[in-house]
C-alpha cells in the first residue's frame, strides 16, 4: 500500500469541504479496487467534523471510509465557528489505511482553516461582514455585530494584541447617505475608521432621504501596529451593503431612553435623549405623549405654556427644547409613565426616569475615632463618617485627599485611599497606628455622592487603657499616694509586656506631682516628677502634694493631671485624672494613702512636725470599680 | 539626625550564630523600648524580640524563644540580638526599632542569611 496526495486540505472557516484524490489518494501494487481501499478515523478532527455527504449529517462521527467515496466526494469535513475570532487555525485527522493481506499504512491529514483563502461561500475576509438594514431618512448604527475585522487582530500574538488595531480605509463612500465616525462624517480627506471606534459603537450610517435604493460602501482593511504604524499582516478589499427600508405606515418605534439627570431645585429640558422615537410617516408634532402617572420628584412644564404641571406635549415640544422637568421635590429617582401615539396606531407604553441630584451635600463627623490603646487599631463607623444630602446617601463613595500622618487606613487589611460607605457601615475600613509617637492623628476625605463632593476631616484619638480612681474629695495642703487605686497601666503592662511610662502635661493647677523617699532614712525631701512609670506607682514612690485654691475662700474646688502614658507596641495616650479637693478635715477617712496631712491640722492635733504616712485609706462608704480614662 | 544603624548581619550556616547591633545617635535609647523586626522574602513582618531598656523586661516570638536574646547597653547606646542556633527560616531582612516619649524611629536593616 502507497499513499499519494497532499495530505493537507485547506478550508473556509465555517464551511464544508470535501477531500479529494489531490489531498488523499491509496493504491496498491496490486492494483486494488478503491472499494476495498478501506480508512478507518483513529483520531477525529478538534475543530469541526468529518462525516459522509449521503448520511445524516448530524449523527455519530464518521469512523471508516473508502477510498472509493474520497474519489467521489462524498467525504466531507465540516469546521465549526468557535466563539473567539481566530485568523488562521490547524487541525489534524489521524488515519490507518488497510488492504488485507498488505500493511496497514498510518496518515495524517493537516487541515488549514484560514482566512485567507478564497471561499466562494463566504464572500469576505472578515470575521463579520453582515451588512445593515437602515430605515428610510433615519440613522443606524454599524456595530460589530454586523462589520468586524478582529480576526485580523487574532493574527497578532495576544500579548501585542493590544498594541494593534484594524484600519479601515473607505475607498468608495455611500451615495445615499453618509458614514460618522463620533458624530463627525467621513470624507475623502478623512477616509478612515479603526476596529476599537467600531467596537466602541462610534461608527454611524445616516441615510439622507429621498427613496430606498440600496446603499454601501467598498473598503480597505489591513493591521495597525502601534502609534499608528502601519505592519506586515492580513489585509482585505470588501464591501459592505446597507439595505434601505420602506417605513411608511408603520408604527412609531419608541427609542432607548437616557434618565434625566439634574439637581434638586434646578429646572432642565427634556431632549431626544429621553424621549424619541422612529416614525418617518409622521411629523413630529404628530406623535402625542400623555402622562399617565407622574412622580413626585417635581413635574413637566411646558416654556410659555404657564407655570403649572402638563400632561399632554409633543415629540416637537421635545425636539425644540419647550418641555422641561422642575425638581421641587426630594432628591430621589422618580419615573414618568407616558402613553404615546402618532394618532393612527394604537397608543404606545413608554417611560421617562427622572434622577433628582442632590444640590449639596454634608459629611456628618460626630465623633473622633477613638482607637483603643492595647489594640492601635479601630474600625470607622457612621460615628465617624455619614454623607447626608435631603436624605442619608448610603452610597457614597470617600477619598483620600490627605492621609494620616502616624498611621493607614486599611480595608480588608491593605492600605487604601477609596471607599464606599457600605465598606464603613460593615465595618470594614480601619485606621491602624503604625508610627507610635501621637496619641492622635487625622486624615481628610473628599465624599462622593450622586455627582456631588463635599470634604471633611475625620479626628483620630488614642484612648488610655488606664483605670483612674480619685475616689472622694482630696485634702489640701496634704501629700497623698499615688500608686495604682488611682492610676493603674497594669492592664496595658501585661498586654505589652513592658513597663509603661507617664508624663505630666498639664496641672495639677494647685500642687505638684513629686517623688517621695523610699525610707525615713533616705535623704532629701520631695522631687518634683515630670515623668514617672507604672513600677513607680506600684512601689508607691509618688506622691501629689495638693495645694489650696489661692486668692480665695477656703472651700472645695476642682483639678486635674493630665497625663500622656505609652508603653511598647502601642500608640501612646492622653488621659486625665479630675478630682475634687476640699480643706483638709481630720475626722474624715479619706479614700486615699496620706503621706502627709496639712502642717497646721498636724500642730493642732499636737503631732510631732514630720511627714509620716498617715497609713492605708480609711474605711469607704463604698467601693466603685476603677473607670476606664477618656483618651484626650 | 535622628539615626539608628543595624550592623552584624551575614551569611552563616545553619547551627551558627551572629551578634546583631542597634546603634542610637541623636536621642538617649536609656528611656526607650527596642525592638527587632524582621521581614523574610514574600512574607509578613514578625517582631522577633523587644526589651525595655529601663527595666530590662524582654518578649520574644515563639519562633525564637531560647535561641536568641535581646539586650541594651545603654552606655554605648546600642542594643543587641544574639542569635543562637540559627535556622534557614531564619533568614530575613532584620530591622530595629525606638519607640519612646513621642519618637518612634526604624534603622535600614540589616540582611540575614542562613544556608549551606
Known amino acids: 500500500l502507497s499513499l499519494k496526495g497532499s495530505q493537507t486540505l485547506t478550508v473556509c472557516p465555517g464551511s464544508v469541504q470535501p477531500l479529494s484524490s489531490q489531498t488523499l489518494r491509496a493504491s496498491s501494487s496490486a492494483g486494488t479496487d478503491p472499494q476495498l481501499l478501506l480508512y478507518r478515523v483513529v483520531r477525529g478532527p478538534q475543530l469541526g467534523r468529518l462525516f459522509h455527504a449521503q448520511q445524516d449529517s448530524t449523527g455519530e462521527a464518521l469512523v471508516n471510509f473508502t477510498q472509493a467515496e474520497v474519489y467521489a466526494g462524498n467525504i466531507l469535513y465540516e469546521h465549526e465557528m468557535p466563539p473567539e475570532p481566530f485568523w488562521e487555525a490547524h487541525d489534524t485527522l489521524e488515519l490507518q489505511l488497510s488492504s488485507p493481506p498488505a500493511r496497514d499504512v498510518a496518515a495524517t491529514l493537516a487541515v488549514a482553516v484560514s482566512f485567507e483563502a478564497a471561499c466562494p461561500q463566504r464572500p469576505s475576509h472578515l470575521w463579520k461582514n453582515k451588512g445593515l438594514w437602515v430605515p428610510e431618512g433615519q440613522r443606524a448604527r454599524i456595530t460589530v455585530a454586523a462589520l468586524d475585522a478582529s480576526n485580523l487582530l487574532a493574527s497578532v500574538p495576544s500579548p501585542q494584541r493590544s498594541e494593534h488595531d484594524v484600519l479601515f480605509q473607505v475607498t468608495q463612500f455611500p451615495s445615499r447617505g453618509q458614514l460618522l465616525v463620533s458624530e463627525e462624517p467621513l470624507h475623502a480627506g478623512q477616509p478612515h475608521f479603526l476596529q476599537s471606534q467600531l467596537a466602541a459603537g462610534q461608527l454611524v450610517y445616516a441615510h439622507g432621504g429621498g427613496g430606498t435604493q440600496q446603499d454601501g460602501f467598498h473598503f480597505r482593511a489591513h493591521l495597525q501596529g502601534p502609534a499608528g504604524a502601519s505592519v506586515a499582516g492580513p489585509q482585505t478589499s470588501e464591501a459592505f451593503a446597507i439595505t434601505v427600508r420602506d417605513v411608511n405606515e408603520r408604527p412609531p418605534q419608541p427609542q432607548a431612553s437616557v434618565p434625566l439627570r439634574l439637581t434638586r431645585g434646578s429646572r432642565a429640558p427634556i431632549s431626544r435623549a429621553q424621549l424619541s422615537v422612529v416614525d418617518p410617516d409622521s411629523a413630529p408634532g404628530e406623535i402625542e405623549y400623555e402622562v399617565q402617572r407622574a412622580p413626585h420628584n417635581g413635574f413637566l412644564s411646558l416654556v410659555g405654556g404657564g407655570l403649572g404641571p402638563v400632561t399632554r406635549f409633543t415629540q416637537a415640544d421635545v425636539d425644540s427644547g419647550r418641555l422641561a422637568f422642575v425638581a421641587n421635590g426630594s432628591s430621589v429617582a422618580g419615573i414618568f409613565q407616558l402613553s404615546m401615539s402618532d394618532g393612527a396606531s394604537p397608543p404606545l407604553p413608554m417611560s421617562l426616569a427622572v434622577d433628582i441630584l442632590p444640590s449639596a451635600i454634608e459629611v456628618q463627623l460626630r465623633a473622633p475615632l477613638e482607637v483603643p490603646q492595647a489594640l492601635g487599631r479601630s474600625s470607622l463607623s457612621q460615628q465617624q463618617l455619614r454623607v447626608v444630602s435631603d436624605r442619608e446617601e448610603p452610597e457614597a463613595a470617600y477619598r483620600l485627599i490627605q492621609g494620616p500622618q502616624y498611621g493607614h487606613l486599611l480595608v480588608g487589611g491593605r492600605p487604601t485611599s477609596a471607599f464606599s460607605q457600605f465598606q464603613i457601615d460593615q465595618g470594614e475600613v480601619v485606621f491602624a497606628f503604625t508610627n507610635f509617637s501621637s496619641s492622635h492623628d487625622h486624615f481628610r476625605v473628599l465624599a462622593l455622592a450622586r455627582g456631588v463632593n463635599a470634604s471633611a476631616v475625620v479626628n483620630v484619638t488614642v484612648r488610655a487603657l488606664l483605670h483612674v480612681w480619685a475616689g472622694g474629695p482630696w485634702p489640701q495642703g496634704a501629700t497623698l499616694r499615688l500608686d495604682p487605686t488611682v492610676l493603674d497601666a497594669g492592664e496595658l503592662a501585661n498586654r505589652t509586656g513592658s513597663v509603661p511610662r507617664f508624663r505630666l502635661l498639664e496641672g495639677p493647677r494647685h500642687g505638684r506631682v513629686v517623688r517621695v523617699p523610699r525610707a525615713r532614712t533616705e535623704p532629701g525631701g520631695s522631687q518634683l516628677v515630670e515623668q514617672f512609670t507604672q513600677q513607680d506607682l506600684e512601689d508607691g514612690r509618688l506622691g501629689l502634694e495638693v495645694g489650696r485654691p489661692e486668692g480665695r475662700a477656703p472651700g472645695p474646688a476642682g483639678d486635674s493631671l493630665t497625663l500622656e502614658l505609652w508603653a511598647q507596641g502601642v500608640p501612646p495616650a492622653v488621659a486625665s485624672l479630675d478630682f475634687a479637693t476640699e480643706p483638709y478635715n481630720a475626722a474624715r477617712p479619706y479614700s486615699v494613702a496620706l503621706l502627709s496631712v496639712p502642717e497646721a491640722a498636724r500642730t493642732e492635733a499636737g503631732k510631732p512636725e514630720s511627714s509620716t504616712p498617715t497609713g492605708e485609706p480609711g474605711p469607704m462608704a463604698s467601693s466603685p470599680e476603677p473607670a476606664v480614662a477618656k483618651g484626650g | 539626625e535622628v539615626q539608628l544603624v543595624e550592623s552584624g548581619g551575614g551569611l552563616v550556616q545553619p547551627g551558627g550564630s551572629l551578634r546583631l547591633s542597634c546603634a542610637a545617635s541623636?536621642?538617649?535609647?536609656?528611656?526607650?523600648?527596642i525592638g527587632w523586626v524582621r521581614r523574610a522574602p514574600g512574607k509578613g513582618t514578625e517582631l522577633v524580640a523587644s526589651?525595655?531598656?529601663?527595666?530590662?523586661?524582654?518578649r520574644y516570638a515563639d519562633s525564637v524563644k531560647g535561641r536568641f536574646t535581646i539586650s541594651c547597653d545603654t552606655s554605648k547606646n546600642t542594643a543587641y540580638l544574639q542569635m543562637n542556633s540559627l535556622r534557614a527560616e531564619d533568614t530575613a531582612v532584620y530591622y530595629c526599632?525606638?519607640?519612646?516619649?513621642?519618637?518612634?524611629?526604624w534603622g535600614q536593616g540589616t540582611t540575614v542569611t542562613v544556608s549551606s
Open positions: 526599632a525606638a519607640q519612646g516619649y513621642r519618637l518612634h524611629y
Open positions: 526589651i525595655d531598656c529601663i527595666y530590662g523586661y524582654t
Open positions: 541623636s536621642f538617649n535609647i536609656k528611656d526607650t523600648y
